[in-house]
């Protein structure tokens, strides 16, 4: 499995380096998760032809995956640090059920899927420390999540492959937009 951020050989070799700031730690954590997603996407794309499908064709799905919109304050027009941070944390919490679904969906990258899931939990904790307005963050309902997970796991093989691909692609896009916004904060 990949080594978590802050534990790579470069860090060990440089013990006198300044400790990472909160922002640097978040940045590194997101890049680590993106690396994990990249590895998972490789396996998915090798297994099926989903990756060749156009975005438009894949858009016809009933998954309610979190996505950044103008109103979320994470883009340059209408940028709002607090609103954006709430959206990032809320979105990551909503992605957790989909990351749970990804477990057992990979053969050669099983540990990688677990690493992405666990690293996301750590990222959420980092971000919650940064947020001032934690009251505005809505946590998904566990019962709703449980029934969603059951529904997703009951799909046929083709739909499960499609779902896996869509989750990875959407999660990657969400993290990219999140990190770009965080780099402005």
């Amino acid at each position: 499995a990949p080594v978590p951020p802050g534990e790579d050989s470069k860090d060990v070799a440089a013990p006198h380096r300044q400790p990472l700031t909160s922002s640097e730690r978040i940045d590194k954590q997101i890049r680590y998760i993106l690396d994990g997603i990249s590895a998972l996407r490789k396996e998915t794309c090798n297994k099926s032809n989903m990756c060749e499908s156009s975005k438009e064709a894949l858009a016809e799905n009933n998954l309610n995956l979190p996505k950044m919109a103008e109103k979320d304050g994470c883009f340059q027009s209408g940028f709002n640090e607090e609103t954006c941070l709430v959206k990032i944390i809320t979105g990551l919490l909503e992605f957790e059920v989909y990351l749970e679904y990804l477990q057992n969906r990979f053969e050669s990258s099983e540990e990688q899927a677990r690493a992405v899931q666990m690293s996301t939990k750590v990222l959420i904790q980092f971000l919650q420390k940064k947020a001032k307005n934690l009251d505005a963050i809505t946590t998904p309902d566990p019962t709703t999540n449980a029934s969603l997970l059951t529904k997703l796991q009951a799909q046929n093989q083709w739909l499960q492959d499609m779902t896996t691909h869509l989750i990875l692609r959407s999660f990657k896009e969400f993290l990219q937009s999140s990190l770009r916004a965080l780099r402005q904060m």
Epitope: R31, L34, F75, Q76, K172, E173, Q176, S177, L179, R180, R183, Q184
Partner: nanobody, 124 residues
Framework: EVQLVESGGGLVQPGGSLKLSCTTS????????VGWFRQAPGKEREFVAD????????WYAESVLGRFTISRDNAKNTVYLEMDGLKPEDTAVYYC?????????????????WGQGTQVTVSS
């Protein structure tokens, strides 16, 4: 890393326009974020604009907002910087840079590949 080549620079009068291109032969260029930076003589290199892997995710420096437009054509492995209403203070060497994570940002450290630069001179 990807090899980046900038082109399109030149001499232009104040109020004029130029379109810079940043091209690569790299296979997965569409997955990279690309940023434009500039460096005027005797000054620090500064952020101009960037575009994410998702083309709708663009950011601009305050000084160029509304005058410059960044865009990408993944089929041509090229990112463009259209510069309108050019001012003498836009004179600089313009560099493009790529970020393999598809994110970008307004600091040089976020990018892992750099081009050699193209000169833009705004003068009458």
């Amino acid at each position: 890393e990807v090899q980046l080549v900038e082109s399109g620079g030149g001499l232009v009068q104040p109020g004029g326009s130029l379109k810079l291109s940043c091209t690569t032969s790299g296979r997965r260029f569409s997955e990279y974020a690309v940023g434009w930076f500039r460096q005027a003589p005797g000054k620090e290199r500064e952020f101009v604009a960037d575009i994410g892997e998702q083309a709708e995710n663009t950011w601009y420096a305050e000084s160029v907002l509304g005058r410059f437009t960044i865009s990408r054509d993944n089929a041509k492995n090229t990112v463009y910087l259209e510069m309108d209403g050019l001012k003498p203070e836009d004179t600089a060497v313009y560099y493009c840079a790529a970020d393999k994570y598809g994110v970008g940002g307004n600091a040089q450290g976020y990018y892992d590949s750099w081009g050699q630069g193209t000169q833009v001179t705004v003068s009458s």
